[in-house]
Amino acid sequence: QPDAINAAVTCCYNFTNRKISVQRLASYRRITSSKCPKEAVIFKTIVAKEICADPKQKWVQDSMDHLDKQTQTPKT
């Protein structure tokens, strides 16, 4: 789970150790704050749960790519 260290900054201190299916993911945001000890990605699931993930892992990068493509393709 992400931790808010103050009102403005959210950091991740641990990463999920299991791969999450892209079908369960709604969005993501990158955590690249100089106030955080680790660079991270926070995925938001379709049930609004936030999960910290390691951006160096291939499944994380693939999931971000998938979500990027979803946002680029207008829903008809």
Epitope: R30, T32, S34, K35, M64
Partner: antibody
């Protein structure tokens, strides 16, 4: 006003070492930023070397710089870059740059004028 | 890897014209993680645009950034002689990978 000034650039022999200093004024590192060293060889493009969090000291390096370059925060207003085993390919103007705020994705809005490092026998 | 590649390497444009510079990422960096800089000889770079499309403080609205995923564009309209410079893109997606974070640069020559 907010300012960065690099110092320590010099003519150095191959295999030599050098330490560059970036001195900040008009702001303090207690406000968190990414402080980075960027270099530019004569007539070439920009190359990121290393970055450090001004508040907590977390560091990141380009893969080619790891082991040979060391970025450090030495006071509340200075960041250094220690360079070892220098080669002719390290000849460049070295810039100190600061991100607009604590996030990496907002770009560098503050740059020093640069300091020239020449590696030659 | 998030390697940035810029095209063209050089472009010539007349005063009042429009110039388009492209920046390609080797993998998707999302829609708000790209910055653009202008650099004139003997000077440090100047931030023009961050977050793909947000103008930095004091930058003319003649500069426009757009794009998402792997393809990004800087458009300069109503080109002025003062726009003669080299322009660089930079990925802001990850600080863990600093190699080739900047594009190779595009020299804009105003005729």
């Amino acid at each position: 006003q907010e300012q960065l000034v690099e110092s320590g650039g010099d003519l150095v022999k191959p295999e030599g070492s050098l330490t560059l200093t970036c001195t900040a004024s008009g702001f303090s590192f207690s406000t968190s930023y990414w402080m980075c060293w960027v270099r530019q060889a004569p007539g070439k493009g920009l190359e990121l070397i290393a970055c450090i969090s001004s508040s907590i000291g977390v560091t990141y390096y380009a893969s080619w710089a790891e082991g040979r370059f060391t970025i450090s925060k030495t006071s509340s207003t200075t960041v250094t870059l220690q360079m070892t085993s220098l080669t002719v390919a390290d000849t460049a103007t070295y810039f100190c740059a600061r991100t607009t705020d604590d996030n990496w994705n907002v770009g560098f809005n503050l740059w020093g004028p640069g300091t020239l490092v020449t590696v030659s026998s | 890897a998030y390697d940035m590649t810029q095209t063209p390497a050089s472009v010539e444009v007349g005063v009042g014209g429009t110039v388009t510079i492209k920046c390609q990422a080797s993998q998707s960096i999302g829609n708000r993680y790209l910055s653009w800089y202008q650099q004139k000889p003997g000077q440090p770079p100047k931030l023009l645009i961050y977050g793909t499309s947000t103008l930095a403080s004091g930058v003319s609205s003649r500069f426009k950034g757009s794009g998402s995923g792997t393809q990004f564009t800087l458009t300069i309209s109503g080109v002025e002689s003062a726009d003669s410079a080299t322009y660089y893109c930079q990925q802001g997606a990850t600080i863990s990978y600093l190699d080739n974070a900047f594009g190779g640069g595009t020299e804009v020559v105003v005729k």
